[in-house]
């Protein structure tokens, strides 16, 4: 799976999106590395 | 709302260094990657890395790595990339971006700022 | 590094006209990469994200597809802001690459 800082970026965002938001305050992509995933 | 605002223009002499600032502000500046990007007079995109303000740590571009240094200052929101050893062929626009999610989901990017390397 | 060649380089069209950019890329790169449109003396404005999913405010006219190493974007009822020059990113790999750019002008 690509890893880069934008895949994350755009993963997490899609994860927020199906979960409403919500999840932990510091599950942000600067925070989370790709095998958060 | 969502703002990158670069610094000023700089006109540069060959051989010497510059640093451009990038400020941050309408979302938390340490949560999102901050790119950069170069474009010469009528030319296309090229990248230069990405920085990581939650701890500093980056991603370079070969091309650049070695003459381009990406830094970040967390008390005042402001990511900055330093070019030394500056040749003409660095006459540029450079831009910085960042992929925000919280408060909007969207790709933002500074307004350009740029670089003159003439003797 | 991976390349990404757009064609055309050059488009000319009219308002109303349905056009097609492709970008296609050297190495498989799934589906992530991103279009923007740039118009002259601004910065890069960014239309699609995940090769076909249009991020927040951009207008439904323009949408995205492709995966792997072919990627286009089309603009189905272009529109006076329209004209300018849309580029193409991957995000797959570092570095990231992007296009030379499609400049798309008034007929």
């Known amino acids: 799976a690509c890893d880069t800082a934008t895949c994350v970026t755009h993963r997490l965002a899609g994860l927020l999106s199906r979960s409403g938001g919500v999840v932990k305050n510091n599950f942000v992509p600067t925070n989370v590395g790709s095998k958060a995933f | 709302q969502v703002q990158l605002v670069q610094s000023g223009a700089e006109v540069v002499k060959p051989g010497a260094s510059v640093k451009i600032s990038c400020k941050a502000s309408g979302y938390t500046f340490t949560d999102y990657y901050m790119n950069w990007v170069k474009q010469a007079p009528g030319q296309g995109l090229e990248w230069i890395g990405d920085v990581n303000p939650n701890n500093g740590g980056t991603h370079y571009n070969q091309k650049f790595k070695g003459r381009a240094t990406l830094t970040v200052d967390t008390s005042i929101s402001t990511a900055y990339m330093e070019l030394s050893r500056l040749r003409s062929d660095d006459t540029a626009v450079y831009y910085c971006?960042?992929?925000?999610?919280?408060?909007?989901?969207?790709?933002?990017w500074g307004q350009g700022t740029l670089l003159t390397v003439s003797s | 590094d991976i390349q990404l060649t757009q064609s055309p380089s050059f488009l000319s069209a009219s308002v109303g006209d349905r056009v097609t950019i492709t970008c296609k890329a050297s190495q498989n790169v799934g589906p992530n990469v991103a279009w923007y449109r740039q118009k002259p003396g601004k910065a890069p404005k960014a239309l699609i994200y995940?090769?076909?999913y249009r991020y927040s405010g951009v207008p439904s006219r323009f949408s995205g597809s492709g995966s792997g190493t072919e990627f286009t974007l089309t603009i189905s009822s272009l529109q006076p802001e329209d004209f300018a020059t849309y580029i193409c990113?991957?995000?797959?790999?570092?570095?990231?690459?992007f296009g030379q750019g499609t400049k798309l002008e008034i007929k």
């Open positions: 971006a960042s992929i925000t999610i919280v408060p909007v989901y969207f790709d933002f």
């Open positions: 995940s090769a076909s």
């Open positions: 990113q991957q995000y797959n790999y570092y570095p990231y690459t």
